[in-house]
């Protein structure tokens, strides 16, 4: 066979679908690899061919499109399962070709089982809601294209195992779930089950996402440096170890990069000759506010080091701040020589 541009196994698109549910999988060639779409390719006389390799097998085989009730079918650039079975798991390849052109890509498809509470090995998308921020909503994901707009599906929302009913701050509104006020207690996994009819059969789509309630932008502040501060003086003798923590609080900000760094005499520690090490630790609050601590350490400090300026800097999308540590050389205690004058007197 003539040469084919092989894009290999596209593990970036690890597709997971639930057992016994419909699945529609678009050929990734047109989405990520080629500069033209399926319609253009089709009108240019190119044919899309599908085949697969079963799990734990090496043999590529054609997909059986003659199963009862058209369980697996192809429509344009979409491979349809109505519904999936557990043993559909494997690597699927779509190949676009004619007599002079060939391009193909493979991708893994995993058919996943779920329990009655929607627990499964499925990787869940995370949706962040701002705490106490007014009405916010989540939308049942990845259900487009499964049924025409003329079909009115029924949608049931669950939090964990429980149908959302008698929840006074959450309103199911069809494909949307509206949070009148998001609280920490709203953290958890939310599942929408979409039920729709097709050709006399009833299909279910199950979609689960994780809701994480995070700090609100209306409460966000620039970074706050808790240490160093004006109340603590780092007083050392030459030869001792100097440890200065820089502890910074960052409000949660969506997509903000939080940075902490030290400067010594205005330079980054990497750019000066003294033997300094910096260790960083990060902790998060329940609403994903962040506290970063960078400990600056000089094992054996010199009198020169104790004259330097040590400044902690912090930056987020809300602004930049800096604070100098108060470092000084310990003054040796004066040595008193006690002279005892002994007088012997006689009465």
């Amino acid at each position: 066979s003539e040469r084919c541009d092989d894009w290999g196994l596209d593990t970036m698109r690890q597709i997971q679908v639930f057992e016994d549910e419909p699945a529609r999988i678009k050929c990734p060639l047109f989405e990520h690899f080629l500069k033209f779409n399926y319609s253009t390719a089709h009108s240019a006389g190119l044919t899309l061919i599908w085949y697969w390799t079963r799990q734990d097998r090496d043999l590529e085989e054609p997909i059986n499109f003659r199963l009862p009730e058209n369980r697996i079918s192809k429509e344009k650039d979409v491979l349809w399962f109505r519904p999936t079975l557990l043993n559909d798991t494997g690597n699927y390849t779509c190949m676009l070709r004619n007599t002079t052109y060939c391009s193909k890509v493979a991708f893994p498809l995993e058919v996943v089982q779920k329990d009655s509470c929607f627990n499964s090995p499925m990787k869940l998308p995370v949706h962040k809601l701002y705490i106490e921020y007014g009405i916010q909503r989540i939308t049942c994901p990845n259900v487009d294209g499964y049924f025409p707009s003329s079909v009115k599906p029924t949608i049931t929302w669950y939090m964990g195992c429980y149908k959302i009913q008698n929840f006074n701050n959450v309103i199911p509104e069809g494909m949307n779930l509206s949070f009148l006020i998001a609280l920490i207690s709203n953290n958890g996994n939310y599942t929408c089950v979409v039920t729709y009819p097709e050709n006399g059969r009833t299909f279910h789509l199950t979609r689960t996402l994780t809701v994480k309630v995070v700090g609100s932008p209306k409460n966000a502040v620039p970074p706050v440096i808790h240490s160093p501060n004006d109340h603590v003086v780092y007083e050392k003798e030459p030869g001792e170890e100097l440890l200065i923590p820089c502890t910074v609080y960052f409000s949660f900000l969506m997509d903000s990069r939080n940075e902490v760094w030290w400067t010594i005499d205005g330079k980054k520690p990497d750019d000066i000759t003294i033997d300094v090490t910096i260790n960083e630790s990060i902790s998060h609050s329940r609403t994903e506010d962040e506290t970063r601590t960078q400990i600056l350490s000089i094992k054996k400090v010199t009198s020169e080091d104790l004259k330097r300026s040590y400044v902690c800097h912090a930056r987020s999308a809300k602004g930049e701040v800096a604070k100098a540590a108060k470092v000084k050389q310990k003054v040796p205690a004066p040595r008193y020589t006690v002279e005892l004058a002994c007088g012997f007197g006689a009465t």
Partner: antibody, heavy 119, light 113 residues
């Protein structure tokens, strides 16, 4: 047993102000409840005025009530409704109700307090 | 804004008969609807929430159905004690305005003969 009791209803002159109080017994507003005010003019239907979420003090009002009515939680057992620029159209029995914004099985109503606006 | 329209009013029924009250929402409120019963001089009493869930202690002769914009309260085997005014209450959110609508229908009086 859980109860809501409204108080503060009175005869008030047009353009006057009045504050109504809703007092809970048998439960406290430190839990997550919507406490709402609803009114009913004599011989007429029910009309929603305001709601407050008791654990966060978040409030919602219909557009017509914004600015003239203010709902507040004043203690762990009391919610008030401040009313200003009153007119004869505000004459009604004012009810306080629990979990009415999103109606749940925890819905509970007080007996109401009568407000009359007349010169 | 959300408008809830109740029909008919008044409605009369014989003891043992069936009464159907309709409530129409001006926009899709899914299943976010409750039904209340009110007798003269009393506060409203919750009968049904979530369009079809019977509140605790409410007799099973009351039932609710519908979703979207059309809702129905049915009283099967009407009793004289069911003479009252019935209200529907719909709720929906407007995320663009960070607002919500909590609107009562105009009420339907049920007369039992």
């Amino acid at each position: 047993q859980e109860q809501l009791v409204e108080s503060g209803g009175d005869l008030v002159k047009p353009e006057g102000s009045l504050t109504l109080t809703c007092t809970a017994s048998g439960f406290s507003f430190s839990s997550n409840y919507w406490i709402c005010w609803v009114r009913q003019a004599p011989g007429k239907g029910l009309e929603w005025i305001a709601c407050i979420y008791t654990s966060t003090d978040t409030t919602y009002y219909p557009n017509w009530a914004k600015g003239r009515f203010t709902i507040s939680k004043t203690s762990s057992t009391t919610v008030t409704l401040q009313m200003t620029s009153l007119t004869a159209a505000d004459t009604a029995t004012y009810f306080c109700a629990r979990d009415l914004l999103v109606v749940t099985s925890f819905n509970l109503w007080g007996q109401g307090t009568l407000v009359t606006v007349s010169s | 804004a959300l408008v809830m329209t109740q029909t008919p009013s008044p409605v009369s029924a014989a003891v043992g008969g069936t009464v159907t009250i309709n409530c129409q929402a001006s926009e899709d409120i899914y299943s976010n609807l409750a039904w209340f019963q009110q007798k003269p001089g009393q506060p409203p009493k919750l009968l049904i929430y979530g369009a079809s869930t019977l509140a605790s202690g409410v007799p099973s002769r009351f039932s609710g159905s519908g979703s979207g914009t059309e809702f129905t309260l049915t009283i099967s085997g009407v009793q004289s004690d069911d003479a009252a005014t019935y209200y529907c209450l719909g709720v929906c959110t407007d995320i663009s305005a960070d607002d919500l609508y909590n609107t009562f229908g105009g009420g339907t009086e049920v007369v039992v003969k």
